[in-house]
């Protein structure tokens, strides 16, 4: 959900606190306020169609609403690319588009949108129950996917609405560890202002804005997919059998992270971009692959002529590769 | 810098199969989908085939299904293309590229004779 | 398939003249969900592979001299050399990057006076 919150105007402190606190202890609630609350949160969303001319055949359309620019999407089935899930289609803003049986035909829609039409026919097409996951690498957002399926009882011609991912999953420890930061800073935020003023702290209220406000052609997300919110990573089957729902968690991990509140999750940037870098909302997770800026220290891509899902040992403007970033 | 080092030469009879190595370095082999080109003496490029090192996926131009396959070994961070059936159309030097085509191969050139 | 179809086959210039050459799609490359045409331009020195030049039809891939400049919308393609040097001596090839399979044009031969 794209909620934004309302902040009630904030008073500075009162002149008999500004001696015990002092300038100084003021300026970190007053960045952590500002952080939680200008903190954005891109979506994905995904919406699946079974064609009604072809019963076997599908029509996915991702979209990425977000501020950032996208410098790559890859789209599976089955699961998210790197989590068992099989590769349909790659396509890079600039550089083009690859894609895999029985993708038929990739394309953008719109500079944040995608669709994918798939064959209906031979062993590897999709059935009803199978699941399809877009992922979309921005800067500066960095990784974001969802996933979606059919309805069990879709019409031909019917398409499921979009869903925006139902899990949060972070590939890399810091993620979690600047959202822990975030999060305890806002405790501390709120702690301060209970402790040192006469008043109640404010709250933040979520906006009275509609979940659904302008999306990019008013799509609308499922409902069900916010109530699989608890569930840190669905895997449907693809066979055409009936779904099985997998919580799945990191190899050979404790589930520790299941529990996390999806909307914690956020990526640090760099030294002095991380303050405005977005915060995964609800009905998105954030994923950002191990290898991606991790090479020789290079900075987060910028997808000047075209970034690539995967690191790109030539520089800044090399890196727009393939799969994800070049 | 990334490099692309392809095995050398292969002269092979017809009937037979060779399989072309490809070792990646440089770079994330697993989140860059490597493409192999075949190129004949004196002639242009023909796209074979593209696959996700990450996952094994393949996808090949319908022209090469049957006659080329794609795979990758994460731990080298290897492709290979194999080609079965050999005759003297498959005489040619092939290429690996990865980066959306931006870095190439050496090639490898492929001989099919009696 | 897509058809890629270069022009002319093979031209032969002086060192500093300006030289275009033409690649037509027998598709349009255009998406036009995002406005960008997926064609690039390779370049292939003998006994060398191809080195990519430009991608989404304009845009020098990094390292590229600037005297090479990619141009056209659509079905229409045109690659330039503003000053041709002695070691623009190759072939050029031009690539469908938007349709499976991604197709190569015939290649146009630059042969230095």
């Known amino acids: 959900m794209r909620t934004e919150a309302q902040v009630p105007a904030l008073q500075p402190p009162e002149p008999g606190l500004e001696g015990a606190m002092g300038h100084r202890t003021l300026v970190l609630p007053w960045v952590l306020l500002t952080l939680c609350v200008t903190a954005g949160t891109p979506e994905v969303w995904v919406q699946v169609r079974m064609e009604a001319t072809e019963l076997s055949s599908f029509t996915i359309r991702c979209g990425f609403l977000g501020s950032g620019s996208i410098s790559l999407v890859t789209v599976s089935w089955g699961g998210p690319n790197g989590a068992g899930g099989t590769t349909l289609a790659v396509l890079h803003p600039e550089r083009g588009i690859r894609q895999w049986a029985p993708a038929r035909q990739a394309r953008w829609e719109t500079q944040s949108s995608i669709s994918l039409i798939l064959e209906g026919s031979g062993a590897s097409s999709p059935c009803a129950n199978t699941t399809f996951c877009c992922k979309f690498a921005s800067f500066p957002e960095g990784s974001w996917e969802a996933c979606g399926s059919l309805p069990p009882s879709s019409d031909p011609g019917l398409s499921a609405p979009p869903t925006p991912a139902p899990i949060l999953r972070a590939d890399l420890a810091g993620i979690l560890g600047v959202s822990g930061v975030l999060l305890f800073g806002c405790v501390y935020l709120l702690h301060l202002l209970r402790r040192h003023k006469h008043r109640p702290a404010p709250r933040l209220q979520p906006s009275r804005t509609s979940p659904q406000a302008p999306r990019a052609r008013a799509w609308a997300p499922s409902q069900a997919s916010q109530a699989a919110l608890h569930v840190p990573y669905a895997t449907i089957n693809t066979s055409c059998r009936p779904a099985t729902l997998d919580t799945a968690h990191p190899h050979g991990g404790p589930s520790w992270w299941a529990s996390l509140p999806t909307h914690a999750a956020h990526r640090p940037q760099g030294p002095a971009a991380w303050a405005s870098t977005p915060i995964p909302a609800r009905g998105s997770f954030v994923s950002v692959e191990n290898g991606l800026y991790a090479q020789a220290g290079e900075r987060p891509p910028h997808t000047g002529p075209g970034l690539t899902l995967f690191p790109d040992p030539r520089g800044p403007r090399a890196m727009e590769g393939p799969l994800g970033v070049r | 810098q990334v490099q692309l080092q392809q095995s050398g030469a292969e002269l092979v009879r017809p009937g037979t199969s060779v399989k072309v190595s490809c070792k990646a370095s440089?770079?994330?082999?697993?989140?860059?989908?490597i493409e192999w080109v075949k190129q004949r003496p004196g002639q242009g490029l023909e796209w074979i085939g593209v696959?996700?090192?990450?996952?094994?996926?393949?996808n090949y131009n319908e022209k090469f299904k049957g006659k080329a396959t794609l795979t990758a070994d994460k731990s080298s961070t290897t492709a290979y293309i194999q080609l079965s059936s050999l005759t003297s159309d498959d005489s040619a030097v092939y290429f690996c590229a990865s980066h959306w085509l931006a870095y190439w191969g050496q090639g490898t050139l492929v001989t099919v004779s009696a | 398939d897509i058809v890629m179809t270069q022009s002319p086959s093979s031209l032969s210039v002086s060192a500093g003249e300006k030289v275009t050459m033409s690649c037509k799609s027998s598709?349009?490359?255009?998406?036009?969900?995002?406005?960008?045409?997926?064609l690039a331009w390779y370049q292939q020195k003998p006994g060398q592979p191809p080195k990519l030049l430009i991608y989404?039809?304009?845009t020098r891939e990094s390292g590229v001299p600037d005297r090479f400049t990619g141009s056209g919308s659509g079905t229409d393609f045109t690659l330039t050399i503003s000053s041709v040097q002695a070691e623009d001596l190759a072939v050029y090839y031009c690539?469908?990057?938007?349709?499976?399979?991604?197709?190569f044009g015939g290649g146009t031969k630059l042969e230095i006076k």
């Open positions: 598709q349009s490359l255009l998406s036009s969900g995002n406005q960008k045409n997926y």
């Open positions: 696959i996700n090192p990450g996952s094994g996926d393949a």
């Open positions: 989404g039809a304009s």
């Open positions: 690539q469908n990057g938007h349709f499976y399979p991604y197709t």
């Open positions: 440089g770079y994330a082999f697993i989140n860059n989908f």
